[in-house]
Interface confidence: medium
């Protein structure tokens, strides 16, 4: 009789259902009714992560670092090497195939999220009485300038890009 | 009816040689694993040798390298080929007929009558 | 090689009444949500025949009044109402690690 359904950790082989291999291992043979699945373990720089019948293991992945890569995590058996960019740089994909640059908020804007290893910068605009005269992947917008408390009047207003200018009241003349 | 018939069981002496023979009629004997277990004379029951339908075999490390099992699916006939004997495979052997639902699932689902072997000098 | 102790080594049950026979494995027979365990049933110049495979399945033919329940290490098979044909021996046996093997067996009397 051929068995009808196989467990979770099986596959069906003709009339049998044979035991998948675990993880860190691949196929060599399929199981027999005398003779278990034949199992080996991954070489050095190969993995598989799941119950499987492979009869290959992956690869472990490169990090290159041409491409701004850098290793995260070793990979292990049944585990894939992890990759994460450089300082400075972020992954252009959600794969993290390869790094750039992390952006720079231009005069005008400021960093409303300081970069990581794999997003970019996240910047905004200066909403009013907030300004940013750099470029700058760190730079938050900064309050303009209150006269006032420093007992100065206010001479220039402020921008986006630019703050105000304070100077002594001038007093008139008689 | 499914009929499995052993014969070939005789006194032998140590280190003698003997071939055991399972005539089997009933059941499409191609399609199914067959196995030999046997019982000792202190009735405790041993797994001794498999077959596969597709010709593999399996035999526990106490019969290793001394004992071959082997099937003629055209005559319906399974065998045990026994060499350098001892005193300890002393037992009445029986061809049996496993079922396996998946590798590790095997039944043995029809029995022969068994076939004694003596070891002894 | 995993090691079935069977117990007791023998019992005698009134006619109508419930047999119990127990078999512990050296380790798990368990595997992927399956027990690998069978029970045969031996009468005195015959060949072993099979009442349960897989733990708790009834081997087609057999009557129900033979019951196998456990998992894992512990296995149990019942006979429930005994009868005069039930004397025999019974034995456990594990598929699910080569060698397969067999527990010692289990003589059952009828008073």
């Known amino acids: 009789e051929p068995a009808t359904a196989c467990g979770e950790k099986q596959y069906p082989v003709n009339s049998l259902c044979c035991d998948l291999c675990p993880p860190g291992q691949k196929l060599v043979n399929d199981c027999t009714e005398v003779s278990k699945t034949e199992c080996q373990s991954c070489g050095k720089g190969e993995f598989l992560s799941t119950w499987n019948r492979e009869k290959y293991c992956h690869e472990h992945r490169y990090c290159n670092p041409n491409l701004g890569l850098r290793i995260q995590s070793e990979g292990t058996l049944n585990t894939d090497t992890t990759c994460v960019c450089v300082e400075g740089q972020h992954c252009t994909s959600h794969t993290c195939e390869s790094c750039t640059p992390h952006s720079l908020c231009l005069p005008g804007f400021g960093v409303k999220q300081i970069a990581t290893g794999l997003l970019d910068t996240v910047c905004e605009p200066c909403p009013l009485g907030f300004f940013s005269n750099v470029s700058s992947a760190f730079e938050k917008c900064h309050r303009w300038t209150s006269c006032e408390r420093k007992g100065l009047v206010e001479q220039h207003v402020g921008t986006n890009k630019t703050d105000v200018v304070c100077g002594f009241q001038s007093r008139m003349r008689t | 009816e499914v009929k499995l018939v052993e014969s070939g069981g005789v006194l032998v002496k140590p280190g003698g040689s003997l071939k055991l023979s399972c005539a089997a009629s009933?059941?499409?004997?191609?399609?199914?694993?067959m196995s030999w277990v046997r019982q000792t004379p202190e009735k405790r029951l041993e797994w001794v040798a498999s077959?596969?339908?597709?010709?593999?075999?399996y035999y526990p490390d106490s019969v290793k390298g001394r004992f071959t099992i082997s099937r003629n699916n055209a005559r319906n006939i399974l065998y045990l080929q026994m060499s350098s004997l001892r005193s300890e495979d002393t037992a009445m052997y029986y061809c049996?007929?496993?079922?396996?639902?998946?590798?590790?699932?095997?039944?043995?689902?029809?029995w022969g009558q068994g076939t004694s072997v003596t070891v002894s000098s | 090689d995993i090691v079935l102790t069977q117990s007791p080594a023998s019992l005698a049950v009134s006619l109508g009444q419930r047999a119990t026979i127990s078999c512990k494995a050296s380790?798990?027979?368990?595997?992927?949500?399956?027990?690998?365990m069978n029970w045969y049933q031996q009468k005195p110049g015959q060949p072993p025949k099979v009442l349960i495979y897989?733990?708790?399945n009834l081997e087609s033919g057999i009557p129900a009044r033979f019951s196998g329940s456990g998992s894992g290490t512990d296995f149990t098979l019942n006979i429930h109402p005994v009868e005069e044909e039930d004397a025999a021996t019974y034995y456990c046996?594990?598929?699910?690690?080569?060698?397969?093997?067999f527990g010692g067996g289990t003589k059952l009397e009828i008073k």
């Open positions: 077959i596969g339908s597709g010709g593999g075999t």
């Open positions: 380790q798990t027979v368990d595997y992927d949500g399956d027990s690998y």
């Open positions: 009933g059941f499409t004997f191609s399609s199914y694993a």
């Open positions: 046996q594990q598929s699910t690690e080569d060698p397969p093997t």
């Open positions: 897989s733990a708790s």
């Open positions: 049996a007929r496993a079922y396996y639902r998946n590798h590790r699932g095997s039944v043995m689902d029809y």
